[in-house]
């Protein structure tokens, strides 16, 4: 499978359009501050070079690795040191260290302006004037803000983005057609980015074994009729795809993902009965569809797990012969029987089983020692079940906004050192679990909720890693991937925290709040709530709720006033003074 020229091989496999798009994504994910025009220039140079290699694979430099070619190209950027500081030192290194260096400098929270959506007519004009540039700009803006976005999936988003403009810019009411589609793409895009970020964190922080365990559990739930060998093959291939994408090898990743989709569709009879529709779609839609496909029905008469994994006299022998294979089989068998469990719960059960075998297979009477291992699973299963039940009840009682506020208070008290924007973003996302998952029946609630919470808590972990401020966050994030959520759930109020000094500026508001969207206004109020808790961590829920109601009354009053700015200035001072007096700020 060795090719004389890797770049020619990928260009031919992917085609010029996808090749150029993927190189643009790769470059934008590495050099997140570079202007669009600079990236386009670099991409065009790489593409022209690739074409010379397609014409003659023996041409000069065509035998170089993609990392060497792309790294050399990135290192030609003139302003590297001024713009990126120490990242410029990467260019002094040789491959593969240079690429590793670039990867380490990817910024999950780059200092980039918020993307402001222009008027619909302005967007449609730009789309019609230069469709290619318009779509490239979309790829560039998403990729630089989401440096771990799953590149082949971003191509699928770009295809949908193009389709939305093609359809809606001809519609009678362009805005009514286009805006809901763009909102949907934005929300799905954020979710997709966060899910992929967890996959990359899993691989990079916990290693291939952790990712493979996750993949065995998820694919076994999704394809319960597939044999273990088939699931193992899919896991191996999927691990390769995600390792490549997370490592910046986007061309190889996209190529291998296409091969995997092809393999799955050619072998769907031995994988899942739910793949038929997916496999009739074009490549990008097909891959997306497979990744989202619903769980197949469980085979009718699966035997009890106890026979092979508890009662058999060969348990320790089978375990000793091939530990990871045996544990993989346990995970496969348990997961295919439990689509109602979250993946992280299944992994906790497998870890408990592994720990028990490690201990018991060295004991005098192994069977006697591990005979009750399944009893140890009960509390592990009940903990997330109870937590989800309680939180769904709270969500149904409060609604999403107030549920988010309850979580904001809860998490600010747990980890008050974390920055306010991070606490607001993470708590808002945690709160979305309610509308996302609580509507589901019992059998679907846990996989929906706990696996979603894993994705959101990973956002907290990667943002915190950039500027660590809390030992408790570091501990929960690094000790165990599958126990992150229980670790955060178990945190109580941080009694060591010294309340933040009061700063009136933090609680100063202006008339611009009146023209904000409902979402932006909520974020302003939630930011104030976090700051309030940081100043007064001992305030009761009732006091915080009452102060927030005062804040709402203040905003409502001033937004109705003739002289809004004066009202905000004068009444704002009164609000702060009143809250100080009442809470002793």
């Amino acid at each position: 499978d060795a090719h004389k020229s890797e770049v020619a091989h990928r260009f031919k496999d992917l085609g010029e359009e996808n090749f150029k798009a993927l190189v643009l994504i790769a470059f934008a994910q590495y050099l997140q501050q570079c202007p669009f025009e600079d990236h386009v220039k670099l991409v065009n140079e790489v593409t022209e070079f690739a074409k010379t290699c397609v014409a003659d694979e023996s041409a000069e430099n065509c035998d170089k690795s993609l990392h060497t070619l792309f790294g050399d190209k990135l290192c030609t950027v003139a302003t590297l040191r001024e713009t990126y500081g120490e990242m410029a030192d990467c260019c002094a290194k040789q491959e593969p260290e240079r690429n590793e260096c670039f990867l380490q400098h990817k910024d999950d929270n780059p200092n980039l302006p918020r993307l402001v959506r222009p008027e619909v007519d302005v967007m449609c004009t730009a789309f019609h004037d230069n469709e290619e540039t318009f779509l490239k700009k979309y790829l560039y803006e998403i990729a630089r803000r989401h440096p771990y976005f799953y590149a082949p999936e971003l191509l699928f988003f770009a295809k949908r983005y193009k389709a939305a403009f093609t359809e809606c810019c001809q519609a009678a009411d362009k805005a009514a057609c286009l805006l809901p589609k763009l909102d949907e793409l934005r929300d799905e895009g954020k979710a997709s980015s966060a899910k992929q970020r967890l996959k990359c964190a899993s691989l990079q922080k916990f290693g291939e074994r952790a990712f493979k365990a996750w993949a065995v559990a998820r694919l076994s739930q999704r394809f319960p009729k597939a044999e273990f060998a088939e699931v193992s093959k899919l896991v191996t291939d999927l691990t390769k795809v995600h390792t490549e994408c997370c490592h910046g090898d986007l061309l190889e990743c996209a190529d291998d993902r296409a091969d995997l989709a092809k393999y799955i569709c050619e072998n769907q009879d031995s994988i899942s009965s739910k793949l038929k529709e997916c496999c009739e779609k074009p490549l990008l839609e097909k891959s997306h569809c497979i990744a989202e496909v619903e769980n197949d029905e469980m085979p009718a008469d699966l035997p009890s797990l106890a026979a092979d994994f508890v009662e058999s006299k060969d348990v320790c022998k089978n375990y000793a012969e091939a530990k990871d294979v045996f544990l993989g089989m346990f995970l496969y068998e348990y997961a295919r029987r439990h689509p109602d469990y979250s993946v992280v719960l299944l992994l906790r059960l497998a870890k408990t089983y592994e720990t028990t075998l490690e201990k018991c297979c060295a004991a005098a009477d192994p069977h006697e020692c591990y005979a009750k291992v399944f009893d140890e699973f009960k509390p592990l299963v009940e903990e997330p079940q109870n937590l989800i039940k309680q939180n769904c009840e709270l969500f149904e009682q409060l609604g999403e906004y107030k549920f988010q506020n309850a979580l904001l208070v809860r998490y600010t008290k747990k980890v008050p050192q974390v920055s306010t924007p991070t606490l607001v973003e993470v708590s808002r996302n945690l709160g979305k679990v309610g509308s996302k998952c609580c509507k589901h029946p019992e059998a679907k609630r846990m996989p929906c909720a706990e696996d979603y919470l894993s994705v959101v808590l990973n956002q907290l972990c990667v943002l915190h890693e950039k500027t660590p401020v809390s030992d408790r966050v570091t501990k929960c994030c690094t000790e165990s991937l599958v126990n992150r959520r229980p670790c955060f759930s178990a945190l109580e109020v941080d009694e060591t925290y010294v309340p933040k000094e009061f700063n009136a500026e933090t609680f100063t508001f202006h008339a611009d709040i009146c023209t904000l969207s409902e979402k932006e206004r909520q974020i302003k109020k939630q930011t104030a709530l976090v700051e309030l808790v940081k100043h007064k961590p001992k305030a009761t829920k009732e006091q915080l709720k009452a102060v927030m109601d005062d804040f709402a009354a203040f905003v409502e009053k001033c937004c109705k006033a003739d002289d809004k700015e004066t009202c905000f200035a004068e009444e704002g001072k009164k609000l702060v003074a009143a809250s100080q007096a009442a809470l002793g700020l």
């Epitope: 107030k402 009452a546 109601d549 009143a578």
Partner: nanobody, 124 residues
Framework: QVQLVESGGGLVQAGDSLRLSCAAS????????MGWFRQAPGKEREFVAR????????YYADSVKGRFTGSRDNAKNTVYLQMNSLKPEDTAVYYC?????????????????WGQGTQVTVSS
């Protein structure tokens, strides 16, 4: 269940003063803002004043600003409305209400529990 009982209404001359009281029982009084509203015959119920949970912040309708003062005594579970320089147009049934968990602070729909009202009549 929350109970609110207003008192202190009556018939007065223009320019006189009255002090309305509202005694509350039920859920924790100090956790919620309280509102005073009024309703004149044939008119909608209108906002008069909002007294916050701690009594440290009060908002008024423009029509009563400078003449009416709201206050509360959380130890006594009571909220007050001191009305000075009364005018004939202040004639109405005055209600006290306890804030709900959502909705506008200046609209009756944002308040959950209501008293039965006390009549205030200002003659010229």
């Amino acid at each position: 269940q929350v109970q609110l009982v207003e008192s202190g209404g009556g018939l007065v001359q223009a320019g006189d003063s009255l002090r309305l009281s509202c005694a509350a029982s039920g859920r924790t009084f100090s956790d919620y803002a309280m509102g005073w509203f009024r309703q004149a015959p044939g008119k909608e119920r209108e906002f008069v004043a909002r007294i916050n949970w701690s009594g440290t912040l009060t908002y008024y309708a423009d029509s009563v600003k400078g003449r009416f003062t709201g206050s509360r005594d959380n130890a006594k579970n009571t909220v007050y409305l001191q009305m000075n320089s009364l005018k004939p147009e202040d004639t109405a049934v005055y209600y006290c209400a306890q804030r709900g968990d959502s909705g506008s602070n200046y609209d009756p729909s944002g308040y959950r529990y209501w008293g039965q009202g006390t009549q205030v009549t200002v003659s010229s």
